[in-house]
Amino acid sequence: CKAMHVAQPAVVLASSRGIASFVCEYASPGKATEVRVTVLRQADSQVTEVCAATYMMGNELTFLDDSICTGTSSGNQVNLTIQGLRAMDTGLYICKVELMYPPPYYLGIGNGTQIYVIDPEPCPDSDF
Protein backbone atom coordinates (compact mmCIF):
# COMPACT_ATOMS: atom_id res chain seq x y z
CA CYS A 1 0.00 0.00 0.00
CA LYS A 2 1.44 3.38 -1.02
CA ALA A 3 -0.82 5.44 1.27
CA MET A 4 0.51 7.00 4.46
CA HIS A 5 -1.67 6.60 7.55
CA VAL A 6 -2.02 9.52 9.97
CA ALA A 7 -3.55 9.04 13.43
CA GLN A 8 -4.88 11.73 15.72
CA PRO A 9 -7.37 11.73 18.63
CA ALA A 10 -11.05 12.04 17.80
CA VAL A 11 -11.85 14.63 20.46
CA VAL A 12 -9.89 17.15 22.56
CA LEU A 13 -11.20 19.69 25.03
CA ALA A 14 -9.33 22.98 25.16
CA SER A 15 -8.25 24.31 28.53
CA SER A 16 -9.95 27.28 30.15
CA ARG A 17 -7.07 29.37 28.81
CA GLY A 18 -7.92 28.39 25.23
CA ILE A 19 -5.08 25.93 24.74
CA ALA A 20 -5.56 22.56 23.03
CA SER A 21 -2.91 19.88 22.56
CA PHE A 22 -2.97 16.65 20.62
CA VAL A 23 -0.60 14.11 19.10
CA CYS A 24 -0.38 13.55 15.35
CA GLU A 25 1.31 10.27 14.48
CA TYR A 26 2.16 9.05 11.00
CA ALA A 27 3.25 5.68 9.69
CA SER A 28 6.07 6.58 7.37
CA PRO A 29 6.37 4.29 4.33
CA GLY A 30 9.89 5.60 3.71
CA LYS A 31 12.79 7.21 5.53
CA ALA A 32 11.95 10.89 5.25
CA THR A 33 14.47 13.55 6.22
CA GLU A 34 12.22 16.55 5.55
CA VAL A 35 8.64 16.58 6.81
CA ARG A 36 5.94 19.23 6.64
CA VAL A 37 3.11 19.23 9.15
CA THR A 38 0.04 21.36 8.57
CA VAL A 39 -2.98 21.86 10.81
CA LEU A 40 -6.15 22.46 8.83
CA ARG A 41 -9.56 23.50 10.14
CA GLN A 42 -12.64 22.14 8.41
CA ALA A 43 -15.95 23.92 8.93
CA ASP A 44 -19.00 23.55 6.70
CA SER A 45 -16.87 21.73 4.10
CA GLN A 46 -14.55 24.76 3.92
CA VAL A 47 -10.92 23.99 4.73
CA THR A 48 -8.48 26.63 5.95
CA GLU A 49 -4.87 26.45 7.08
CA VAL A 50 -4.32 27.11 10.78
CA CYS A 51 -0.54 26.71 10.82
CA ALA A 52 2.28 24.81 9.18
CA ALA A 53 5.88 23.89 9.87
CA THR A 54 8.59 22.09 7.94
CA TYR A 55 11.25 20.25 9.90
CA MET A 56 14.21 18.00 9.35
CA MET A 57 13.98 14.64 11.10
CA GLY A 58 15.78 14.82 14.42
CA ASN A 59 15.39 18.60 14.61
CA GLU A 60 12.78 20.66 16.38
CA LEU A 61 9.51 21.69 14.81
CA THR A 62 9.54 25.43 14.11
CA PHE A 63 6.38 27.39 13.34
CA LEU A 64 6.46 31.03 12.26
CA ASP A 65 6.82 33.56 15.07
CA ASP A 66 3.23 34.81 14.68
CA SER A 67 1.76 31.30 14.55
CA ILE A 68 -0.85 30.19 17.08
CA CYS A 69 0.72 26.73 17.02
CA THR A 70 3.75 25.27 18.73
CA GLY A 71 5.00 21.71 18.60
CA THR A 72 7.66 19.15 19.22
CA SER A 73 8.59 16.10 17.20
CA SER A 74 9.82 12.68 18.23
CA GLY A 75 10.32 10.12 15.51
CA ASN A 76 7.06 9.77 13.58
CA GLN A 77 5.09 11.60 16.22
CA VAL A 78 4.33 15.30 16.45
CA ASN A 79 2.94 16.92 19.59
CA LEU A 80 0.88 19.93 18.53
CA THR A 81 -0.44 22.76 20.69
CA ILE A 82 -2.85 25.40 19.46
CA GLN A 83 -3.22 28.54 21.56
CA GLY A 84 -5.58 31.48 21.75
CA LEU A 85 -8.67 29.44 21.02
CA ARG A 86 -12.17 30.78 21.70
CA ALA A 87 -15.59 29.16 21.61
CA MET A 88 -16.07 30.24 18.01
CA ASP A 89 -12.96 28.21 17.08
CA THR A 90 -14.63 24.94 18.05
CA GLY A 91 -14.35 22.62 15.07
CA LEU A 92 -12.53 19.81 13.31
CA TYR A 93 -8.76 20.20 13.15
CA ILE A 94 -7.04 17.97 10.61
CA CYS A 95 -3.40 16.95 10.78
CA LYS A 96 -1.77 16.82 7.36
CA VAL A 97 1.69 15.30 6.98
CA GLU A 98 3.85 15.48 3.86
CA LEU A 99 7.09 13.60 3.46
CA MET A 100 8.84 16.11 1.25
CA TYR A 101 12.29 14.56 0.85
CA PRO A 102 13.86 12.28 -0.22
CA PRO A 103 11.67 10.82 -2.98
CA PRO A 104 9.04 9.63 -3.18
CA TYR A 105 6.71 12.28 -1.80
CA TYR A 106 3.94 10.99 0.45
CA LEU A 107 0.79 12.73 1.67
CA GLY A 108 -1.05 11.74 4.82
CA ILE A 109 -4.34 13.21 6.00
CA GLY A 110 -5.72 12.45 9.46
CA ASN A 111 -9.43 12.02 10.18
CA GLY A 112 -9.39 15.17 12.27
CA THR A 113 -9.62 16.07 15.94
CA GLN A 114 -12.80 17.76 17.11
CA ILE A 115 -11.61 20.50 19.43
CA TYR A 116 -14.19 21.91 21.82
CA VAL A 117 -13.52 25.35 23.22
CA ILE A 118 -15.60 26.83 26.03
CA ASP A 119 -15.07 30.48 26.83
CA PRO A 120 -14.51 30.94 30.57
CA GLU A 121 -17.26 32.65 32.55
CA PRO A 122 -16.22 36.15 33.60
CA CYS A 123 -15.46 36.33 37.31
CA PRO A 124 -18.33 38.00 39.20
CA ASP A 125 -17.51 41.16 41.16
CA SER A 126 -16.75 40.35 44.76
CA ASP A 127 -18.82 41.93 47.51
CA PHE A 128 -17.08 42.36 50.85
Epitope: M4, V47, A52, P103, L107, I109
Partner: antibody, heavy 118, light 108 residues
Framework: EVQLVESGGGLVKPGGSLRLSCAAS????????MHWVRQAPGKGLEWVSF????????YYADSVKGRFTISRDNAKNSLYLQMNSLRAEDTAVYYC???????????WGQGTMVTVSS | EIVLTQSPATLSVSPGERATLSCRAS???????LAWYQQKPGQAPRLLIY???SRATGIPDRFSGSGSGTDFTLTISRLEPEDFAVYYC?????????FGQGTKVEIK
Amino acid sequence: EVQLVESGGGLVKPGGSLRLSCAASGFTFSSYTMHWVRQAPGKGLEWVSFISYDGNTKYYADSVKGRFTISRDNAKNSLYLQMNSLRAEDTAVYYCARGGLLGPFDLWGQGTMVTVSS
Amino acid sequence: EIVLTQSPATLSVSPGERATLSCRASQSVGSSYLAWYQQKPGQAPRLLIYGASSRATGIPDRFSGSGSGTDFTLTISRLEPEDFAVYYCQQYGSSPWTFGQGTKVEIK
Protein backbone atom coordinates in the same frame (compact mmCIF):
# COMPACT_ATOMS: atom_id res chain seq x y z
CA GLU B 1 -10.82 36.34 -7.98
CA VAL B 2 -8.99 33.08 -7.33
CA GLN B 3 -7.27 32.10 -10.56
CA LEU B 4 -4.22 30.80 -12.40
CA VAL B 5 -3.19 32.19 -15.78
CA GLU B 6 -0.55 30.50 -17.93
CA SER B 7 1.53 32.13 -20.65
CA GLY B 8 4.63 31.48 -22.73
CA GLY B 9 3.43 28.73 -25.03
CA GLY B 10 4.13 28.73 -28.75
CA LEU B 11 5.81 27.00 -31.66
CA VAL B 12 9.38 25.80 -31.16
CA LYS B 13 11.73 23.59 -33.15
CA PRO B 14 12.94 20.22 -31.80
CA GLY B 15 15.90 20.79 -29.49
CA GLY B 16 14.68 24.28 -28.68
CA SER B 17 13.66 25.86 -25.39
CA LEU B 18 10.61 27.57 -23.98
CA ARG B 19 9.71 29.05 -20.60
CA LEU B 20 6.14 28.84 -19.35
CA SER B 21 4.77 31.11 -16.65
CA CYS B 22 1.75 30.82 -14.40
CA ALA B 23 0.45 33.88 -12.56
CA ALA B 24 -1.56 33.17 -9.42
CA SER B 25 -4.00 35.59 -7.80
CA GLY B 26 -6.69 35.65 -5.15
CA PHE B 27 -5.03 33.28 -2.69
CA THR B 28 -1.92 32.94 -0.53
CA PHE B 29 0.38 31.42 -3.13
CA SER B 30 3.09 30.31 -0.68
CA SER B 31 0.60 28.14 1.23
CA TYR B 32 0.17 25.74 -1.68
CA THR B 33 2.24 23.24 -3.59
CA MET B 34 2.04 23.67 -7.35
CA HIS B 35 2.12 21.35 -10.35
CA TRP B 36 2.40 21.34 -14.11
CA VAL B 37 0.17 18.90 -15.99
CA ARG B 38 0.10 18.44 -19.76
CA GLN B 39 -2.30 17.03 -22.31
CA ALA B 40 -1.18 15.98 -25.78
CA PRO B 41 -3.75 16.57 -28.56
CA GLY B 42 -6.58 14.06 -28.23
CA LYS B 43 -4.90 12.35 -25.26
CA GLY B 44 -5.32 12.19 -21.50
CA LEU B 45 -3.78 14.12 -18.63
CA GLU B 46 -0.12 13.58 -17.74
CA TRP B 47 1.47 14.97 -14.58
CA VAL B 48 4.74 16.73 -15.41
CA SER B 49 6.23 18.36 -12.32
CA PHE B 50 5.72 19.37 -8.67
CA ILE B 51 7.23 22.08 -6.50
CA SER B 52 6.96 22.51 -2.74
CA TYR B 53 5.79 25.57 -0.84
CA ASP B 54 9.21 27.22 -0.59
CA GLY B 55 10.50 25.85 -3.89
CA ASN B 56 13.17 23.68 -2.29
CA THR B 57 11.66 20.32 -3.25
CA LYS B 58 10.93 19.45 -6.88
CA TYR B 59 9.75 16.29 -8.61
CA TYR B 60 9.50 15.42 -12.29
CA ALA B 61 7.92 12.79 -14.49
CA ASP B 62 10.50 10.43 -15.97
CA SER B 63 9.56 11.67 -19.45
CA VAL B 64 10.87 15.20 -18.72
CA LYS B 65 13.55 14.59 -16.08
CA GLY B 66 16.82 16.34 -16.93
CA ARG B 67 15.16 18.55 -19.55
CA PHE B 68 12.51 20.52 -17.63
CA THR B 69 12.99 22.69 -14.55
CA ILE B 70 10.19 23.91 -12.31
CA SER B 71 10.57 27.00 -10.13
CA ARG B 72 8.47 29.53 -8.28
CA ASP B 73 8.71 33.10 -7.02
CA ASN B 74 6.44 33.52 -4.02
CA ALA B 75 7.06 37.26 -3.91
CA LYS B 76 5.64 37.50 -7.44
CA ASN B 77 2.96 34.81 -6.99
CA SER B 78 4.36 33.05 -10.02
CA LEU B 79 5.19 29.52 -11.14
CA TYR B 80 7.53 28.68 -14.02
CA LEU B 81 8.50 25.74 -16.20
CA GLN B 82 11.75 25.97 -18.14
CA MET B 83 11.64 23.45 -20.98
CA ASN B 84 14.87 22.56 -22.78
CA SER B 85 15.78 19.98 -25.44
CA LEU B 86 12.17 19.91 -26.57
CA ARG B 87 10.89 16.95 -28.56
CA ALA B 88 7.88 16.41 -30.79
CA GLU B 89 6.28 14.31 -28.04
CA ASP B 90 6.32 17.33 -25.72
CA THR B 91 3.62 18.93 -27.91
CA ALA B 92 0.67 19.49 -25.58
CA VAL B 93 -1.47 21.96 -23.69
CA TYR B 94 0.36 22.71 -20.45
CA TYR B 95 -1.70 23.48 -17.35
CA CYS B 96 -0.54 24.80 -14.02
CA ALA B 97 -2.54 23.41 -11.12
CA ARG B 98 -2.71 24.10 -7.41
CA GLY B 99 -2.23 21.28 -4.95
CA GLY B 100 -5.22 21.84 -2.67
CA LEU B 101 -4.96 21.89 1.11
CA LEU B 102 -6.25 18.31 1.20
CA GLY B 103 -4.17 17.21 -1.78
CA PRO B 104 -6.22 17.17 -4.98
CA PHE B 105 -5.60 19.64 -7.79
CA ASP B 106 -8.39 22.05 -6.88
CA LEU B 107 -7.54 24.98 -9.16
CA TRP B 108 -6.35 24.89 -12.78
CA GLY B 109 -5.24 27.48 -15.27
CA GLN B 110 -6.75 27.70 -18.74
CA GLY B 111 -3.68 26.10 -20.32
CA THR B 112 -1.07 27.21 -22.82
CA MET B 113 -0.29 25.33 -26.04
CA VAL B 114 3.25 24.20 -26.77
CA THR B 115 3.95 22.88 -30.27
CA VAL B 116 7.30 21.29 -31.07
CA SER B 117 7.74 20.93 -34.82
CA SER B 118 10.31 21.56 -37.48
CA GLU C 1 4.21 4.09 -9.79
CA ILE C 2 0.49 3.57 -9.23
CA VAL C 3 -1.27 2.84 -12.52
CA LEU C 4 -4.95 3.80 -12.72
CA THR C 5 -7.14 2.00 -15.26
CA GLN C 6 -10.54 3.46 -16.10
CA SER C 7 -13.45 1.62 -17.65
CA PRO C 8 -15.22 1.80 -19.92
CA ALA C 9 -13.25 3.98 -22.32
CA THR C 10 -16.53 5.36 -23.67
CA LEU C 11 -19.97 5.31 -22.07
CA SER C 12 -23.05 6.07 -24.16
CA VAL C 13 -25.92 7.24 -21.97
CA SER C 14 -29.19 9.07 -22.50
CA PRO C 15 -29.89 12.30 -20.58
CA GLY C 16 -31.66 11.55 -17.31
CA GLU C 17 -30.06 8.13 -16.99
CA ARG C 18 -27.43 6.99 -14.49
CA ALA C 19 -23.77 6.72 -15.42
CA THR C 20 -21.30 4.56 -13.50
CA LEU C 21 -17.57 5.00 -14.13
CA SER C 22 -14.87 2.74 -12.74
CA CYS C 23 -11.26 3.39 -11.73
CA ARG C 24 -8.97 0.53 -10.69
CA ALA C 25 -5.55 1.05 -9.14
CA SER C 26 -2.55 -1.24 -9.63
CA GLN C 27 -1.96 -1.11 -5.87
CA SER C 28 -3.91 0.07 -2.86
CA VAL C 29 -4.65 3.80 -2.72
CA GLY C 30 -5.85 5.27 0.55
CA SER C 31 -9.40 6.53 0.07
CA SER C 32 -8.27 9.98 1.19
CA TYR C 33 -6.11 10.28 -1.91
CA LEU C 34 -8.37 9.54 -4.90
CA ALA C 35 -9.94 12.32 -6.95
CA TRP C 36 -12.22 12.62 -9.98
CA TYR C 37 -12.07 15.42 -12.56
CA GLN C 38 -14.38 16.49 -15.36
CA GLN C 39 -13.05 17.95 -18.59
CA LYS C 40 -15.05 19.45 -21.42
CA PRO C 41 -13.59 20.13 -24.90
CA GLY C 42 -11.31 23.16 -24.93
CA GLN C 43 -11.50 23.59 -21.17
CA ALA C 44 -9.25 22.83 -18.22
CA PRO C 45 -10.14 19.91 -15.94
CA ARG C 46 -12.39 20.66 -12.97
CA LEU C 47 -12.21 18.91 -9.61
CA LEU C 48 -15.41 16.99 -8.85
CA ILE C 49 -14.61 14.55 -6.05
CA TYR C 50 -11.69 14.25 -3.62
CA GLY C 51 -11.00 11.80 -0.85
CA ALA C 52 -12.89 9.22 -2.97
CA SER C 53 -16.30 10.50 -1.86
CA SER C 54 -16.24 14.21 -0.91
CA ARG C 55 -17.75 16.64 -3.41
CA ALA C 56 -15.69 19.70 -4.26
CA THR C 57 -17.17 23.15 -3.72
CA GLY C 58 -20.06 23.90 -6.05
CA ILE C 59 -20.42 20.36 -7.42
CA PRO C 60 -24.07 19.22 -7.64
CA ASP C 61 -25.16 16.26 -5.54
CA ARG C 62 -25.95 14.12 -8.59
CA PHE C 63 -22.21 13.42 -8.60
CA SER C 64 -21.05 10.90 -6.02
CA GLY C 65 -17.90 8.91 -5.45
CA SER C 66 -17.27 5.67 -3.60
CA GLY C 67 -14.71 2.93 -3.16
CA SER C 68 -11.53 2.11 -1.30
CA GLY C 69 -8.35 0.13 -1.74
CA THR C 70 -8.00 -0.48 -5.47
CA ASP C 71 -11.57 -0.05 -6.74
CA PHE C 72 -13.30 3.31 -7.04
CA THR C 73 -16.50 4.46 -8.69
CA LEU C 74 -17.91 7.77 -9.88
CA THR C 75 -21.69 7.82 -10.25
CA ILE C 76 -23.75 10.49 -11.98
CA SER C 77 -27.29 9.78 -10.83
CA ARG C 78 -29.22 11.64 -13.55
CA LEU C 79 -27.21 12.89 -16.50
CA GLU C 80 -27.77 16.51 -17.44
CA PRO C 81 -26.79 17.82 -20.90
CA GLU C 82 -23.79 19.61 -19.38
CA ASP C 83 -22.44 16.37 -17.88
CA PHE C 84 -21.34 14.92 -21.21
CA ALA C 85 -17.58 15.18 -20.98
CA VAL C 86 -14.42 13.19 -20.24
CA TYR C 87 -13.83 12.07 -16.64
CA TYR C 88 -10.44 11.28 -15.11
CA CYS C 89 -9.52 9.66 -11.81
CA GLN C 90 -6.27 10.59 -10.09
CA GLN C 91 -4.25 9.45 -7.10
CA TYR C 92 -2.42 12.12 -5.13
CA GLY C 93 -1.13 10.18 -2.14
CA SER C 94 2.39 9.64 -3.44
CA SER C 95 4.67 10.68 -6.27
CA PRO C 96 4.50 10.36 -9.17
CA TRP C 97 0.98 11.76 -9.27
CA THR C 98 -0.98 9.66 -11.77
CA PHE C 99 -4.20 9.92 -13.77
CA GLY C 100 -6.39 7.31 -15.36
CA GLN C 101 -6.67 7.39 -19.15
CA GLY C 102 -10.18 8.84 -18.96
CA THR C 103 -13.76 7.81 -19.65
CA LYS C 104 -15.74 9.71 -22.25
CA VAL C 105 -19.43 10.04 -21.41
CA GLU C 106 -21.31 10.67 -24.64
CA ILE C 107 -24.94 11.15 -25.58
CA LYS C 108 -26.66 7.95 -26.66
